[in-house]
């Protein structure tokens, strides 16, 4: 139809034919002419989007072919354009294909296969094998243009269809397409570094990846040194790859090959999508020599009672890691070790724990026991104190000669000699007798081992028969022995004596 | 202004290789999928290869899988297309293109460069 315009105003070209689509049989010549006192050009685009020129107002192409297929737009000076669509009807190429399918979820994908004859019936998609499509898939044909897929969704992903249409009850169908579909942005990208501190000596070399996740490859992702505003960090390499669909993993290796001082800092690793941003951060310290540090033990003085356990643990920081471990009891090198083991899983961990396991402890294991520990470039000590807490053992009760009766008894902590007399009616000796003498002897070669106290009494107190006991007693326990009297006329006798340990 | 500048083609003989490249301006390159498109003499318009615009998703036409190689250097702004056991078949005038993922077409051209495989 010829366009219109109002009097005085420019008006756009008409065309011959003047009609709005016109079908041409392939081989046939296609013969257009703008008329227009201001034509410009002819132009046509192809189904590839390339765009042809003709500068005559009249196109004649001679045995056209369905590739011609499309839209005729004549345009003056005055940059008014009027169009026309042409269908070269190829009995052998009813569709025009050749382009890629690709689709963005939740958007609308073009099957681009536009009609080269619109005369014919249920121009529509089917699935390349025959199947059905997905039952959610909805789909819109327009012969000029292809068949829209509306709202894609991921699950279309590598579905393969055919364009199809029903030509003199004969179904012809195209080429086939398959979709590739690539996801929409719904959340931040996952990122994560495998060590959130790193500690260094100057030298060493500093590496650490980070790893970015999302569904696409669109995702932009970088290493910023925060100093503290953030600076972008060039020299960093990029690995990445396909995990399956909707499943992109990029890695961003940062590399300082010999770390100074003043490399150490924060470094983020941040990444961004159209949905949002994500950033984690790893914190690099760099020394200048190795160190071992040993954390303050609560008490180094231990005490342990006779036949029990006491673990002694050591807690300390070393970097690079410790090479010597070693336990010293008394100044002299134990063999044992004792169980070393890292603090934490984490692979830069510095902290170290050592356990020495004492078993069964005996009065003369007590002393002093020392953790020493080394790397290459430190050294440092920690030492315990061990006290070994035992009952009380009467080593000896004597009548001496000058009527004295001496008790000796061991143990530690100092054990308390208390002398009880009672007669022989009671079940229980509770009356007190006061010592004469009080002596602390230290026969231990060290101040660890247990302590000897004497104590006596006068005998010649006791005016009736009985028994005189002896009662070693500290914190552990107590032990007691008994002298028995018995008076024939003015002379007394020890008649016996023995010992008694109460638990 | 768009410009796509390709280079690389020449004569070639079958079996052999082939590395064409194509100088982008005029655009953001890094943020758009790029692709080669081929007109054989006499024929019509073949697409060939697409990438992504990060340079991971490469796509192909069954015609050249296994062949062909696109790439890219986003910092140099330069696509390529690595052609391997090339045939006759392959003789055609190869185009960079701008592939416009959401209308499912290329919107910008370069030029061409010629590829002939012949012995």
């Known amino acids: 139809s010829q366009p219109s315009a109002s009097p005085g105003e420019p008006s756009p070209p008409s065309i011959h034919p003047a009609q709005s689509e016109l079908i041409v049989e392939a081989g046939d010549t296609l013969s257009l002419t703008c008329i227009d006192p201001d034509f410009v050009r002819w132009t046509f685009k192809t189904y590839f989007n390339e765009m042809v020129e003709n500068k005559k107002n009249e196109w004649i192409q001679e045995k056209a072919e369905a590739t011609r297929t499309g839209t005729y737009t004549c345009s003056n000076s005055n940059g008014l354009t009027s169009s026309i669509y042409v269908f070269v009807r190829d009995p052998a190429k009813l569709f025009l294909v050749g382009l890629p399918l690709f689709g963005k979820e939740d958007s609308d994908a073009l099957v681009r296969c536009p009609l080269t004859d619109p005369q014919v019936s249920n121009y529509s998609l089917i699935e390349c094998d025959g199947k059905s499509l997905p039952t959610d898939l909805t789909f819109v044909p327009n012969p000029k243009a292809g068949i829209t897929i509306k709202n894609v969704k991921r699950a279309y992903h590598r579905l393969c269809v055919r364009c199809a249409a029903q030509r003199d009850g004969t179904w012809l169908h195209s080429d086939k397409f398959t979709l590739k579909v690539r996801a929409a942005i719904k959340a931040i990208p996952v990122v994560s570094v495998p060590e959130t501190s790193h500690l260094l000596k100057k030298g060493d070399t500093f590496t650490v990846v980070c790893t970015i996740k999302d569904v696409s490859t669109s995702v932009n992702s970088m290493w910023l040194k925060m100093n503290p505003q953030p600076q972008h960090i060039a020299q960093v390499k990029h690995n990445s790859w396909h995990r399956g669909d909707f499943n992109y993993e990029r890695q961003e290796t940062l590399t300082i090959s010999s770390a100074r001082v003043d490399d150490s800092g924060v470094f983020m690793c941040y990444a961004n999508n159209t949905f949002g941003s994500a950033n984690v951060t790893t914190t690099l310290k760099v020394v200048e020599k190795g160190f071992i540090n040993i954390s303050p033990v609560k008490n180094t003085t231990v005490f342990v009672t006779d036949g029990e356990n006491v673990d002694l643990v050591v807690e300390y920081e070393a970097y690079p890691k410790p090479e010597h471990q070693q336990w010293i009891y008394m100044n002299r090198t134990s063999a044992n070790k004792g169980k070393d083991y890292v603090k934490s899983d984490n692979k830069s961990n510095i902290r170290y724990v050592n356990q020495l396991r004492l078993t069964r402890l005996k009065g003369t294991e007590g002393g002093t026991y020392t953790f020493l520990v080394s790397n290459s470039d430190a050294s440092a000590s920690v030492t315990f104190n061990v006290y070994v807490n035992t009952k009380p053992e009467i080593l000896t009760y004597d009548r001496l000669i000058n009527g004295m009766l001496q008790c000796v008894a061991e143990g530690f902590p100092e054990p308390t000699i208390d002398w009880y007399f009672c007669t022989g009616a009671e079940q229980r000796c509770t009356t007190p007798v006061s010592p004469v003498d009080v002596q602390v002897q230290n026969v231990s070669v060290s101040p660890f081992g247990k302590l000897v106290v004497q104590s006596s009494i006068d005998s010649s107190v006791f005016r009736h028969n009985g028994t005189v006991e002896c009662k070693a007693s500290n914190d552990v326990g107590k032990s007691s022995a008994f002298f028995n009297f018995a008076f024939k006329g003015n002379n007394k006798e020890q008649i016996q004596a023995h010992t008694l340990f109460t638990p | 202004e768009v410009q796509l500048l390709e280079s690389g083609g020449g004569l070639v003989q079958p079996g052999g290789s082939l590395r064409l490249s194509c100088a982008a301006s005029g655009f953001t390159f890094k943020v758009e999928d790029m692709g080669w498109v081929r007109q054989a003499p006499g024929k019509g318009l073949e697409w060939v290869s697409i990438i992504d615009s990060p340079g991971i998703g490469t796509y192909y036409a069954d015609s050249v899988k296994g062949r062909f190689t696109i790439s890219r250097d986003n910092s140099k702004n330069t696509l390529y297309l690595q052609m391997n056991s090339l045939r006759a078949e392959d003789t055609a005038v190869y185009y960079c293109?701008?592939?416009?993922?959401?209308?499912?077409?290329?919107?910008?051209w370069g030029q061409g460069t010629l590829v002939t495989v012949s012995s």
């Open positions: 293109a701008k592939w416009n993922f959401d209308s499912n077409q290329f919107d910008y």
